[in-house]
Interface confidence: low
């Protein structure tokens, strides 16, 4: 009888211990869940900083190449360029790197998608209309909205093979390129209206980039 009591006591202790183990385990799991949310928030914040850096650099660059910059005195232009270069330098001191974990197939898909975009950029730097239509078909392939033009099906299947974060980056890169083309287009239209050696030089520069 005493033995039975002892056994019962021991079993009681074992069950108590295992239930506290379960509590501890679920508490740890809860903590990890909370941490996972914070890790994702950290990655999102870092990605946002990365994007902000890109946007700032793009804006500084577009100011330096704006039509207004051509219509001010050399002295003012020099001063503004110094400020712009200083801002660019300070922006570049911010280094953020958000690594994406990819499997080999996603790695290949990313490489392929990047190569396609690079090829378009290299081929059409002097040919904005064509660049735009080609990039639009690539952009439509990444967009969830109803496309406004042809969707590049082949590119779409490649992008689908990329990691989700890479898909977003590809889409952002295409948006940036299309924005740049839009700006270049406006600049060239303005230049076509103005006469002079300056526009001729720019035209020659543009024409030296086909492939």
């Amino acid at each position: 009888m005493a033995q039975a009591k002892i056994n019962a006591k021991a079993n009681e202790g074992r069950f108590c211990r295992s239930s506290s183990m379960a509590d501890r385990s679920s508490r740890l799991l809860e903590s990890l869940d909370q941490l996972e949310l914070r890790v994702e928030a950290l990655r999102e914040a870092a990605t946002a900083v990365e994007q902000e850096k890109e946007i700032l650099l793009e804006m500084i660059h577009s100011i330096q190449n704006s039509q207004d910059m051509r219509q001010i005195s050399d002295g003012e232009r020099e001063e503004l360029n110094l400020t712009a270069n200083r801002l660019m330098g300070r922006t570049l001191t911010v280094e953020v790197s958000v690594e994406t974990i990819r499997n080999p197939q996603q790695q290949e898909s990313l490489k392929h998608a990047t190569r396609i975009i690079d090829e378009v950029v290299n081929k059409f730097l002097d040919d904005l209309g064509n660049a735009k239509s080609h990039l639009m078909s690539l952009y439509s392939a990444c967009s969830s909205e109803v496309p406004h033009g042809p969707v590049d099906q082949k590119f779409q299947s490649i992008v689908i093979g990329c990691a989700l974060e890479d898909q977003k980056k590809i889409k952002r890169r295409l948006e940036t390129l299309l924005r740049n083309i839009e700006n270049s287009d406006k600049a060239i239209k303005l230049l076509e209206h103005s006469k002079g050696a300056g526009s001729k030089t720019l035209q020659q520069n543009a024409e030296s980039r086909f492939n």
């Epitope: 290299n122 209309g129 064509n130 080609h134 082949k154 024409e207 030296s208 086909f210 492939n211």
Partner: antibody, heavy 122, light 112 residues
Framework: QVQLVQSGAEVKKPGASVKVSCKAS????????FYWVRQAPGQRLEWIGY????????TYNRKFKGRVTITVDKSASTAYMELSSLRSEDTAVYYC???????????????WGQGTLVTVSS | DVVMTQSPLSLPVTLGQPASISCRSS???????????LHWFQQRPGQSPRLLIH???NRFSGVPDRFSGSGSGTDFTLKISRVEAEDVGVYYC?????????FGGGTKVEIK
């Protein structure tokens, strides 16, 4: 295998237009662009322009702007080059050649059609 | 437009001997992407041009290894290590870095 087959020889009067076709086979038609090049007697090869069959975007050599139109018919896997306001100096052999690959490097004049002789004479 | 200058204009060679053709461009053919789009073509009598070498030194598929290309910037060379009877024809260099793509005037290779 890749083949580009062009339409037959043409004789035209000055001021007229000519349309040369180039039928592609042996590869995915919209994956590569098309170049058009001509070779006049005693002259060097001269690039006329190109077209991307995927979106029909094209670029022309400034020298031919306003006189040349390059088009494609995707359903027939055929590219066309039309030259208007012909003059005697347009007498040449006109070639189509496969251009670059849309999905990465490669291409660039790697396959050529057999050529189409266009004679402009009054 | 970029002017491509080839030399010599005519190249009489002995079968089995080497041959070398030079091509010079009026401006650098190095693209901002780092590639150099300089190609070499062979045109046999009565035939269409045929791609031999693309991007300076890459032999196109099916091209015999006696053909080789080299050079950089504005100076390029096509070499035939041992000329064979079937190599007779006109050889052209071409640049596709700048628009419009342009071609050299050609070098006629003939057997002595």
């Amino acid at each position: 295998q890749v083949q580009l087959v062009q339409s037959g020889a043409e004789v035209k009067k000055p001021g007229a237009s000519v349309k040369v076709s180039c039928k592609a086979s042996g590869y995915s038609f919209t994956d590569y662009t098309f170049y058009w090049v001509r070779q006049a007697p005693g002259q060097r090869l001269e690039w006329i322009g190109y077209i991307d069959p995927y979106n029909a975007g094209n670029t022309y050599n400034r020298k031919f702007k306003g006189r040349v139109t390059i088009t494609v018919d995707k359903s027939a896997s055929t590219a066309y080059m039309e030259l208007s306001s012909l003059r005697s100096e347009d007498t040449a052999v006109y070639y189509c050649a496969r251009g670059y690959y849309r999905y990465g490097g490669g291409g660039d004049f790697d396959y050529w059609g057999q050529g189409t002789l266009v004679t402009v004479s009054s | 437009d970029v002017v491509m200058t080839q030399s010599p204009l005519s190249l009489p060679v002995t079968l089995g001997q080497p041959a070398s053709i030079s091509c010079r461009s009026s401006q650098s053919l190095v693209h901002s992407n780092g590639n150099t789009y300089l190609h070499w073509f062979q045109q046999r009598p009565g035939q269409s041009p045929r791609l031999l070498i693309h991007k300076v030194s890459n032999r196109f598929s099916g091209v015999p290894d006696r053909f080789s290309g080299s050079g950089s910037g504005t100076d390029f060379t096509l070499k035939i290590s041992r000329v064979e009877a079937e190599d007779v024809g006109v050889y052209y260099c071409s640049q596709n870095t700048h628009i419009p793509p342009t071609f050299g005037g050609g070098t006629k290779v003939e057997i002595k």
